[in-house]
């Protein structure tokens, strides 16, 4: 039993760290392996995580951890029975993967704009709440070439989108993900997509259809 790609771990920096690794052959992760983890601090309790299969030879472990502080370091030990396959350490603050933004919705707004709104996945008291910036991906469901990416670097989890920038009558999907620049984090997973019909009509069609009389 050998580890092909050693564990790679990320923390949401609030309650959970996730480690993933690849074995050298198909493995029943939960039956054959376990990952023990312990805060590298005198008197800390040792914990055990039973992994699940992500693929035939890929295992993933989700470990509940206390609200992390920057200096926290965990010792990780990967076991196959009584054989210690791999040992390593993991500092959650150096390997942050934010939680996925939630509840993405699209609302018609004044002046032919769409208002995209989502929820910050962190409570206000958490370090990451005020650190997140977002990326919004908007794509045409029927035209893979027609997509736009918006970086939302201001605080509020909203994006205003001019309907005129999208094709009229087309169905669009949006999804959002987050990252925390000060923690040099990776991007979060994408949120589930939300879909809407862009029913905006080009501006000229909104002009009144008057007959022009020439006055002499």
């Amino acid at each position: 039993v050998k580890v092909l790609h050693e564990p790679s771990c990320f923390s949401d920096y609030i309650s959970t760290s996730v480690c993933q690794w690849k074995m050298d052959h198909p493995t029943n992760c939960s039956a054959e392996l376990r990952l023990s983890y312990q805060l590298d601090f005198m008197g800390s309790e040792n914990h055990t995580c039973v992994p699940e299969n992500r693929e035939d030879s890929v295992c993933v472990c989700s470990m509940p951890i206390d609200d992390a502080v920057e200096a926290d370091v965990y010792q990780l030990d990967l076991w196959a029975g009584q054989q210690l396959l791999w040992s390593g350490s993991f500092q959650p603050s150096k390997h942050v993967k934010p939680r996925t933004p939630g509840n993405l919705t699209v609302h018609p707004n004044i002046s032919h704009t769409w208002l995209l709104m989502w929820t910050n996945p962190y409570p206000t008291e958490n370090h990451l709440h005020s650190e997140l910036t977002y990326m919004v991906n908007v794509s045409n469901d029927n035209d893979p070439e027609d997509f736009k990416v918006y970086n939302v670097t201001y605080m509020g989890p909203t994006l205003r989108l001019a309907a005129s920038t999208l094709k009229s009558g087309a169905s669009y999907s949006a999804r959002v993900r987050a990252w925390a620049q000060t923690y040099n984090s990776t991007w979060s997973d994408w949120s589930p997509s939300t879909t809407w019909l862009n029913y905006y009509e080009p501006w000229e069609q909104h002009l009144p259809h008057h007959h022009h009389h020439h006055h002499h």
Partner: antibody, heavy 124, light 112 residues
Framework: EVQLQQSGPELVKPGASVKISCKAS????????MNWVKQSHGKSLEWIGD????????SYNQKFKGKATLTVDKSSSAAYMELRSLTSEDSAVYYC?????????????????WGQGTSVTVSS | DIVMTQAAPSVPVTPGESVSISCRSS???????????LFWFVQRPGQSPQLLIY???NLASGVPDRFSGSGSGTAFTLRISRVEAEDVGVYYC?????????FGSGTKLDIK
């Protein structure tokens, strides 16, 4: 006080099977692996395999696969080893020895407690 | 499988003197985490084996500090200072780095 109490000596005929027991006390039986070790007369020690009582997971020395079967009874905190198709080569003293904690870390020790041994003699 | 070799079948020693028992492994027992998974046991006459040293140099509970373990990744030494009559027995090294765990052939400590 941790104790591992093994069953008594066995005299068995070639081709037969035997099941020896190891009753644990003084610790949480399900938290520790149980090892089984063979010692032929005047010879060294050979690791046969281990079992974790919490879920019955086993690992075997390839040499003893098909020869030894490890089981546990959690309700009585007992580990068992069955040896089948016995020959004179299987005549030995067999020990159970407590292994590492399932919840342990890299700083472990193992085989800190041993049973008194069970002598198995295969003879017609 | 990792082969554990104890070259000396027996070592004679006079009570009160020191003695060293050696063991070699066919593969380094030094794990990437810095621990060396080499264990020493003694089997006194008519008794079950007893753990003496774990992870190469750590003394097991209740073992007198006359016993000490040292070594590198593949060469290991058990040293007994001020040998006493009760130290007679067979000393085994064991690797616990990978399955199947394997023992050396044993070295018998003879009191002169």
């Amino acid at each position: 006080e941790v104790q591992l109490q093994q069953s008594g000596p066995e005299l068995v005929k070639p081709g037969a099977s035997v099941k020896i027991s190891c009753k644990a006390s003084g610790y949480t039986f399900t938290d520790y692996y149980m090892n089984w070790v063979k010692q032929s007369h005047g010879k060294s020690l050979e690791w046969i395999g281990d079992i974790i009582p919490s879920n019955g997971g086993t690992s075997y020395n390839q040499k003893f696969k098909g020869k030894a079967t490890l089981t546990v009874d959690k309700s009585s905190s007992a580990a068992y080893m069955e040896l089948r198709s016995l020959t004179s080569e299987d005549s030995a003293v067999y020990y159970c020895a407590r292994g590492i904690s399932y919840y342990g870390n890299r700083y472990y020790f193992t085989m800190d407690y041993w049973g008194q041994g069970t002598s198995v003699t295969v003879s017609s | 499988d990792i082969v554990m070799t104890q070259a000396a079948p027996s070592v004679p020693v006079t009570p009160g003197e020191s003695v060293s028992i050696s063991c070699r492994s066919s593969k380094s027992l030094l794990h990437s985490n810095g621990n060396t998974y080499l264990f020493w046991f003694v089997q006194r006459p008519g008794q079950s084996p007893q753990l003496l040293i774990y992870r190469m140099s750590n003394l097991a509970s209740g073992v007198p500090d006359r016993f000490s373990g040292s070594g590198s990744g593949t060469a290991f030494t058990l040293r007994i200072s001020r040998v006493e009559a009760e130290d007679v027995g067979v000393y085994y090294c064991m690797q616990h780095l990978e399955y199947p765990f394997t023992f050396g052939s044993g070295t018998k400590l003879d009191i002169k």
